[in-house]
């Protein structure tokens, strides 16, 4: 038998600084976890202790902290080289800042494989980006040789922006040519390395017929085997073991987000390549592994130009941006309405000639809305002032919701108006009307959406029926502020962008803005 | 895009030398372990030399040892493969790979490499 030790991170999301327990800004440092330090002295210290380790990534390194929005990739390729990474899988938001924001930083600066099988370019981009990622990787280990094939979301073009010159397609498909073509080069031991979710995961270890693990990302998913070490709740063992449709147990595994855990998967195989057994858990990265020193410096060194970067100006306001609690919690603000704007903005993918755009609408709780922004400060807005606004480092994801969810999230919104609760929501797409005579759970009067589906943007009533796309923060998604009817019968749910850089991305593109409060929300006469 | 371009091969007789060379394009060439292999009508492609990407370690096929030498300059993109006491037995065409991977020790195993050139025909008359 032969042993092989996969270490894997996943959806890591620019977090190259150790960060607090729920991923945000490091506060109390005695507290903190995960970075890039720490990551590699405990990577180092298993590559030590054991022969045959492999480290790998499966997607999203890309996006997420004020380090991806300076150094736009560089910081990636950088410190996975630093680390020693043996194989990356592209995620979908690797293409954030278009395909060249992909093969300048990363591409052409990682000295290790990046690898994905389903993405295939055409026109003038296939000379262009050919070679610089590869279906597969064929690595050497001891005495043996691993195969790592590699895997994307095929809805990375409503998830980013990679342009029409790559095609995105369906997993299995591309995945079983390019896992034949192995076993033809002798090469009996793959591991599906990739980015689209758990339940593709799962598919691919069922239906790809030669693949022996499954390393995935995309859905942020926990597994673990026993008592969880921190606040994560497991969504299955570790590995999740799934029946191949050919008769095999295939170990899958993901590993959280953010670098808060590094995976840690012992496999067995026999001399025919085949799996014998498979364990492990992923390891907490807390404060009890020492940050290696060196890398550390090299971060310390890197920090110096983000500092810089969030005082200088974005660009100007004209007008009062009031992200006030008594505002944003009562009715319409104009810091909502800029916030759901630079949302829909940041989601402008024309995939379809029927379709002026994939999705229309935000929601956004008033209750993350953090402060305002005063003109009279030249007009300047500086990274720093958007921090205030949005301190707690969330996402803008994309969600598919039926009308009736959506219907009770407006309820929800005014079920107990009037206590400067967060819950109250701000909106882009949307004309909502409430009546607060009316009892809680009955106060939407009306609710019109703006169509996707239309050459000429118009607002027709909400069908209760109909599945919508819509733009909304993470904490909604997740069911915060009470929202437990999105997170139960949310239909799909894709992580998306940096909520502060979403916003500064669209300050600096619009150069001035004046946000109105124009008429989104209404409260019928007599009630308010 | 990554290409791969051999040069230098010929016919040359049984205890002659030549010197083949590939120029790398496309991508930090200083990041490849470099291969040559070769193949001879009706058989399998083989292995015959392997530089680090630093410029070593090397290692070389039993059949090559101490008649070839590999070598290679990182500014000029460019790897070599110097041929000496040439045999007939050494008649092939000769193939130049590349090998993208984040370690230090190169390989001799074929299906690691991940870029090929198009090969150069050496033939060894007696």
């Known amino acids: 038998a032969w042993e092989l030790t996969i270490l894997h991170t996943n959806d890591v999301h620019s977090r190259l600084e150790q960060t607090s327990e729920d991923s945000s800004k490091c506060v109390n440092a005695s507290r903190c976890m995960g970075g890039v330090a720490r990551l590699f002295t405990k990577v180092q210290q298993i590559r030590r202790a054991e022969p045959n380790v492999l480290l790998l990534d499966a997607g999203d390194q890309y996006q997420g902290t004020i380090w991806f929005t300076v150094y736009k990739g560089a910081e990636v390729a950088h410190f996975m080289n630093a680390l020693r990474y043996d194989a990356m899988a592209l995620g979908n938001h690797e293409f954030d800042n278009g395909v060249e924001g992909l093969i300048e930083p990363l591409l052409k600066e990682a000295k290790f494989p990046i690898l994905s099988a389903n993405i295939k370019a055409k026109g003038p981009l296939a000379s262009q980006i050919s070679g610089l990622y590869l279906p597969y990787k064929v690595l050497p280990v001891g005495d043996e040789v691993v195969g790592i094939v590699g895997y994307t979301s095929k809805e990375t073009p409503f998830l980013s922006n990679p342009g029409t010159n790559l095609v995105f397609e369906d997993e299995i498909t591309a995945l079983q040519p390019e896992v034949d073509k192995l076993k033809t080069l002798n090469v009996n031991k793959i591991i599906a390395l990739g980015h689209s979710g758990f339940e593709m995961d799962k598919l691919i270890a069922q239906k790809v017929r030669g693949v022996d693990v499954v390393v995935g990302g995309h859905s942020n998913t926990f597994l673990y085997t026993g008592n969880p070490p921190s606040k994560e709740v497991p969504a299955g063992k570790y590995p999740f073991i799934v029946t191949s449709d050919d008769g095999r147990k295939v170990p899958v595994v993901q590993a959280y987000a953010f670098g808060k855990y590094l995976g840690y998967l012992k496999i067995e195989f026999d001399e025919r390549g085949n799996v014998i057994s498979s364990h492990g858990n992923p390891i907490l990265l807390n404060s009890s592994i020492p940050e290696d020193p060196s890398i550390k410096a090299d971060i310390n060194k890197w920090r110096i130009k983000l500092d810089n970067y969030s005082t200088q100006e974005l660009g100007k306001t004209i007008v009062y941006l009031d992200g006030s609690s008594q505002s944003c919690r009562f009715r319409e603000c104009n810091m909502g309405n800029l916030i759901c704007d630079a949302m829909i903005n940041n989601n402008l993918r024309h995939t379809d000639e029927m379709f002026w755009n994939h999705v229309s609408m935000c929601i956004l709780n008033g209750g993350g809305i953090r402060s305002p922004i005063d003109e009279r400060n030249n007009g300047t807005i500086t990274w720093e002032n958007l921090a205030a606004v949005l301190p707690f480092g969330g996402t803008f994801d994309l969600v598919q919701l039926k009308g009736s969810t959506l219907k009770k999230a407006f309820e929800h919104s005014v079920h107990r108006y009037g206590q400067s609760t967060g819950e109250f929501l701000q909106v882009g797409g949307i004309h909502v009307v409430y009546d607060l005579s009316r009892k809680p759970g009955d106060r939407v009067v009306k609710l019109d959406v703006l169509c996707t589906k239309c050459r000429v943007p118009s607002y027709d009533p909400l069908k209760m029926d109909e599945v919508y796309k819509v733009i909304l923060p993470n904490f909604l998604a997740n069911g915060g502020d009470g929202f437990q009817m999105i997170k139960d019968e949310l239909l799909r749910h894709d992580s998306g962008d940096q909520d502060i850089n979403v916003v500064s991305t669209y300050i600096s593109k619009m150069k001035v803005i004046y946000p109105a409060v124009e008429g989104r929300i209404k409260f019928s006469t007599g009630s308010h | 895009e990554v290409q791969l371009v051999e040069s230098g091969g010929g016919l040359v007789q049984a205890g002659g030398s030549l010197r083949l060379s590939c120029v790398v394009s496309?991508?930090?060439?200083?990041?490849?372990?470099m291969g040559w292999f070769r193949q001879a009508p009706g058989k399998e492609r083989e292995f015959v030399a392997v530089?680090?990407?630093?410029?070593?370690?090397?290692y070389y096929a039993d059949s090559v040892k101490g008649r070839f030498t590999i070598s290679r300059d990182n500014a000029k993109n460019t790897v070599y493969l110097q041929m000496n006491s040439l045999k007939p037995e050494d008649t092939a065409v000769y193939y130049c790979a590349g090998d993208w991977r984040n370690s230090d020790s190169p390989s001799k195993l074929k299906p690691v490499y991940d870029y090929w050139g198009q090969g150069t025909q050496v033939t060894v008359s007696s």
């Open positions: 496309g991508r930090t060439f200083s990041n490849y372990h």
């Open positions: 530089i680090g990407r630093s410029g070593g370690p090397t």
